[in-house]
Interface confidence: medium
């Protein structure tokens, strides 16, 4: 259901401003208040983990997903959108959120990013192309889209803890991740830090305390020496490819 909540999805694309999430130091085992599991009897535990997750905005999806109409050519019939798998390098795109972490949308194609492809003070602005099948870039659905943002911001990039709407609002080495009240700039995860991996596509609700994604050259994988009774609760950490 739209109200199901999973505490620990890694959905960090385009988070809103942090109302105040805190976090660990870049070298600590758990990064700054990223993806913290809820205590207190699973206060916000999700009920229906394995439903395709309905969404209205990319922010509600995982870092390896974007929000779009599920059926090709359906033109968003009934306005139903779900979280879909991100597009890999060289795949077609309409906006940055469609591309997998480490990539951005340039001239309608997902390209590798090196965190320096946007001049300081500019927000990424993708070129809208008619891909024919992805309809959630339409501006008429009542939800703001990254593609309709103004191209310039006139403030300096946000430091850790600054409220943000998207990762381009944050300084290098930080991503924009939800910290409940808002989205804030949090450190991109380093090797060995705990990360969050969705068990299955669309298996999450709106994450409240999000972790950033793993940094360049790292992937979120099960920690080899981590043995727990439940497969579903295995610890994932950022590891070298």
């Amino acid at each position: 259901t739209l109200n199901s909540v999973l505490i620990n999805s890694n959905a960090i694309k385009n988070l809103p401003p942090p109302l105040g999430g805190a976090g660990g130091q870049p070298g600590s085992a758990v990064s700054v208040a990223p993806g913290v599991l809820y205590e207190g009897g699973n206060k916000y535990q999700t009920l229906d983990n394995y439903q395709p997750y309905p969404c209205a905005e990319d922010e509600e999806c995982g870092s390896d997903e974007y929000c779009s109409s599920p059926s090709r050519g359906a033109a968003g019939v009934g306005g139903v959108q779900i979280c879909l798998a991100c597009r890999k390098r060289r795949k077609r795109c309409m906006r940055h959120a469609m591309c997998c972490p480490g990539n951005y949308c340039k001239n309608g194609i997902c390209m590798p990013s090196d965190h320096s492809h946007f001049p300081r003070g500019e927000i990424e602005e993708s070129i809208i192309e008619n891909l024919g099948n992805d309809h959630n870039a339409a501006a008429g659905d009542g939800y703001p889209r990254r593609t309709t943002l103004t191209s310039k911001i006139y403030h300096t990039k946000g430091q850790e803890g600054s409220v943000c709407l998207r990762s381009s609002d944050c300084a290098a080495g930080l991503c924009c991740a939800r910290h409940f009240w808002s989205k804030i700039c949090k450190p991109v995860l380093k090797e060995g830090q705990v990360c969050t991996k969705h068990k299955r596509k669309g298996s999450h609700g709106l994450e409240i305390f999000q972790r950033c994604y793993c940094g360049e050259g790292l992937a979120c994988r099960i920690q080899k020496d981590h043995h727990q009774a439940s497969n579903s609760s295995r610890l994932h950490t950022c590891q070298r490819h």
Partner: antibody, heavy 110, light 112 residues
Framework: EVQLVQSGAEVKKPGASVKVSCKAS????????IHWVRQAPGQGLEWMGW????????TYAQKFQARVTMSRDTSSSTAYMELSRLESDDTAMYFC?????WGQGTLVTV | QSVLTQPPSVSGAPGQRVTISCTGS?????????VHWYQQLPGTAPKLLIY???NRPSGVPDRFSGSKSGASASLAITGLRPDDEADYYC???????????FGGGTQLTVLS
């Protein structure tokens, strides 16, 4: 169980300072920000600022910038909010919040 | 004067549906910042009802729902009950103030 327990009610004279504490338990203190929100009698909620429990970095609402100091003691998992140069309209209930959990409130009467 | 505008009061009979609006601007709700809703009973701390526009924490009945349109958000309560009588606040972030902001609050009265 996550809990935020605040210090007891305070009565202060105008011009004085007050320091309210907020002791956290049931979670990793340094993984969260602590916000302070106040509510004058019969009035709405007003955000005062937050402190990053790990680094101690703070952000204050402009209105309180010159008078408020937020601090924390990681060894005791306690956050503090000190408000100086008190005036009668600072009479309010002061809440600390981890965003999803709130303290019970501390009544400060000036 | 609050940055987020709520009606001072609303009322309804038991079983009825009421909505509480929260009107912001392009620097808060309209900019895409989340809206959260709190219920506050007299003498208690605010309790989270809705977060991220429309998400309910567990334990909050599905009679409570939230939505957003443009620079406004609203809270709907169906099947009104006497114990719903409380103050309700919306909350967001305002980038022109660099501050978290609350609505002025709405007092809900359940008519007997």
């Amino acid at each position: 169980e996550v809990q935020l327990v605040q210090s007891g009610a305070e009565v202060k004279k105008p011009g004085a300072s007050v320091k309210v504490s907020c002791k956290a338990s049931g979670y990793t203190f340094t993984d969260y920000y602590i916000h302070w929100v106040r509510q004058a009698p019969g009035q709405g909620l007003e955000w005062m600022g937050w402190i990053h429990s790990n680094s101690g970095a703070t952000t204050y609402a402009q209105k309180f910038q010159a008078r408020v100091t937020m601090s924390r003691d990681t060894s005791s998992s306690t956050a503090y909010m000190e408000l100086s140069r008190l005036e009668s309209d600072d009479t309010a209930m002061y809440f600390c919040s981890r965003e999803d959990y709130w303290g019970q409130g501390t009544l400060v009467t000036v | 004067q609050s940055v987020l505008t709520q009606p001072p009061s609303v009322s309804g009979a038991p079983g009825q549906r009421v909505t509480i609006s929260c009107t912001g601007s392009s620097s808060n709700i309209g900019a895409g910042y989340d809206v959260h809703w709190y219920q506050q009973l007299p003498g208690t701390a605010p309790k989270l009802l809705i977060y991220g526009y429309s998400n309910r924490p567990s334990g909050v009945p599905d009679r409570f729902s939230g939505s957003k349109s443009g620079a406004s958000a609203s809270l709907a309560i169906t099947g009104l009950r006497p114990d719903d009588e409380a103050d309700y606040y919306c909350q967001s972030y305002d980038n022109s103030l660099s501050s978290y902001v609350f609505g002025g609050g709405t007092q809900l009265t359940v008519l007997s």
